[in-house]
């Protein structure tokens, strides 16, 4: 139902990486505007992105309040010149989003190798602990702060002179690996949340190689 000159939003989709979370939908508005509401399963609806002509709404500020909650959003459609207008049932036209649980579903962003340091035949590779928009006690938490031991990293490494790769895992942000002295190595890391069933793995980090400025060598 609804007024003759508005159409309901459709294809409501959550786009979320490292908890930065945006709701997207269609269609591009013609003579209509949208307002978004979000709530937890047991909570009250909160309105966001009032009377917008955009087809996306940043809901990060709401979902970071409790990333383990399950959220539902809905998008209301209003005639552009008459936002008080309602549908035939006395309510504005709206469409519900799929449910979204940030902790279980946010995509893992591409990790970054922060540094690597060689000491003899050992190399310590450190993964940057990316800051999220999740807050606790007025400070922003890192990805590791949020996920704890649920988050692991897989390291791929190989000699610059060969194609054969090796791998190692860590549930911290550091790897300590054995290397052959006098050889240069390249590194790439991937974030994984083993307990998940969807959005389990990140894309690989950019490759970093020894002999470039991120590294440090000590005898």
């Amino acid at each position: 139902s609804g007024t003759t000159n508005t159409v309901a939003a459709y294809n409501l989709t959550w786009k979320s990486t490292n908890f930065k979370t945006i709701l997207e939908w269609e269609p591009k508005p013609v003579n209509q505007v949208y307002t978004v509401q979000i709530s937890t399963k047991s909570g009250d609806w909160k309105s966001k992105c009032f009377y917008t002509t955009d087809t996306e709404c940043d809901l990060t500020d709401e979902i970071v309040k409790d990333v383990k909650q399950t959220y539902l959003a809905r998008v209301f459609s209003y005639p552009a010149g008459n936002v008080e207008s309602t549908g035939s049932a006395g309510e504005p036209l709206y469409e519900n989003s799929p449910e979204f649980t940030p902790y279980l579903e946010t995509n893992l962003g591409q990790p970054t190798i922060q540094s690597f340091e060689q000491v003899g035949t050992k190399v310590n590779v450190t993964v940057e602990d990316e800051r999220t928009l999740v807050r606790r006690n007025n400070t922003f938490l890192s990805l590791r702060d949020v996920f704890g031991k649920d988050l692991i990293y897989t390291l791929y490494y190989w000699k610059s002179s060969s194609s054969g790769k090796k791998t190692a895992k860590t549930n911290t942000n550091e790897f300590l690996i054995d290397v052959d002295k006098g050889e240069n190595y390249c590194f790439s890391v991937q974030a994984v949340i083993p307990s998940r069933t969807v959005n389990r793995k990140s894309t690989d980090s950019p490759v970093e190689c020894m002999g470039q400025e991120k590294g440090e060598f000590r005898e």
Epitope: T154, K166, T167, A168, K169, R200, D204
Partner: antibody
Framework: EVQLVESGGGLVQPGGSLRLSCAAS????????MHWVRQAPGKGLEWVGW????????IYDPKFQDRFTISADTSKNTAYLQMNSLRAEDTAVYYC??????????WGQGTLVTVSS | DIQMTQSPSSLSASVGDRVTITCKGQ??????LSWYQQKPGKAPKLLIY???SLADGVPSRFSGSGSGTDFTLTISSLQPEDFATYYC?????????FGQGTKVEIK
């Protein structure tokens, strides 16, 4: 229901080649790591290698690096093990397994490869 | 490569016995160790992961302990269906390596 089904095993002459398949159902292989593990008759388990089907990264036990190749086709939800220059000592049951990164939670039933003249 | 030394290679025990199998790594594994049970003609089955965590559906008589280089699988009260071969696996760095296996037989 998660299932892994290996196929492609059989009798092959020394020096020959064989391609094993591991067809997955109930999940997308691109979301996991996929491994090949083998077991010679009456012997223990031996890790062959893994693939991340999403990006094609492969890791092998160095002893298999030159003769074996692991690949995956995400559109078919299938992982493969290409084995070349086969030897009598490659005779084994070959298993594929799904890896969550924390553990190998599902295994196929295995396919027997016999290398003999 | 990290060699995994599993012991004993076999043992005989009776129903109700407490059974302990150990696995020793050459280097620190940081809990990247899991235990598997295999019955003749069957694929291995996950029992324990992260050295101490019980896999879904596995009876609580199975437990894992240890850290660093030394790990243990314990069956607190052996049941008839537990007669099988048990393997540890380190998967913290490649090449991943299994222990040689421990065959648990009926006394």
């Amino acid at each position: 229901e998660v299932q892994l089904v290996e196929s492609g095993g059989g009798l092959v002459q020394p020096g020959g080649s064989l391609r094993l398949s591991c067809a997955a159902s109930g999940f997308n292989i691109k979301d996991y790591y996929m491994h090949w593990v083998r077991q010679a008759p009456g012997k223990g388990l031996e890790w062959v290698g893994w693939i991340d089907p999403e990006n094609g990264n492969t890791i092998y036990d160095p002893k298999f690096q030159d003769r074996f190749t692991i690949s995956a086709d995400t559109s078919k939800n299938t992982a493969y093990l290409q084995m070349n220059s086969l030897r009598a000592e490659d005779t084994a049951v070959y298993y594929c397994a799904r890896d969550t990164a924390a553990y190998f939670d599902y295994w196929g039933q295995g396919t027997l490869v016999t290398v003999s003249s | 490569d990290i060699q995994m030394t599993q012991s004993p290679s076999s043992l005989s025990a009776s129903v109700g016995d407490r059974v302990t199998i150990t696995c020793k790594g050459q280097r620190v594994l940081n809990s990247w160790l899991s235990w598997y049970q295999q019955k003749p003609g069957k694929a291995p089955k996950l029992l324990i992961y992260y050295a101490t965590s019980l896999a879904d559906g596995v009876p609580s008589r199975f437990s894992g302990s240890g850290s660093g280089t030394d790990f243990t699988l314990t069956i607190s009260s052996l049941q008839p269906e537990d007669f099988a071969t048990y393997y540890c696996l380190q998967h913290g760095e490649s090449p991943f390596t299994f222990g040689q296996g421990t065959k648990v037989e009926i006394k």
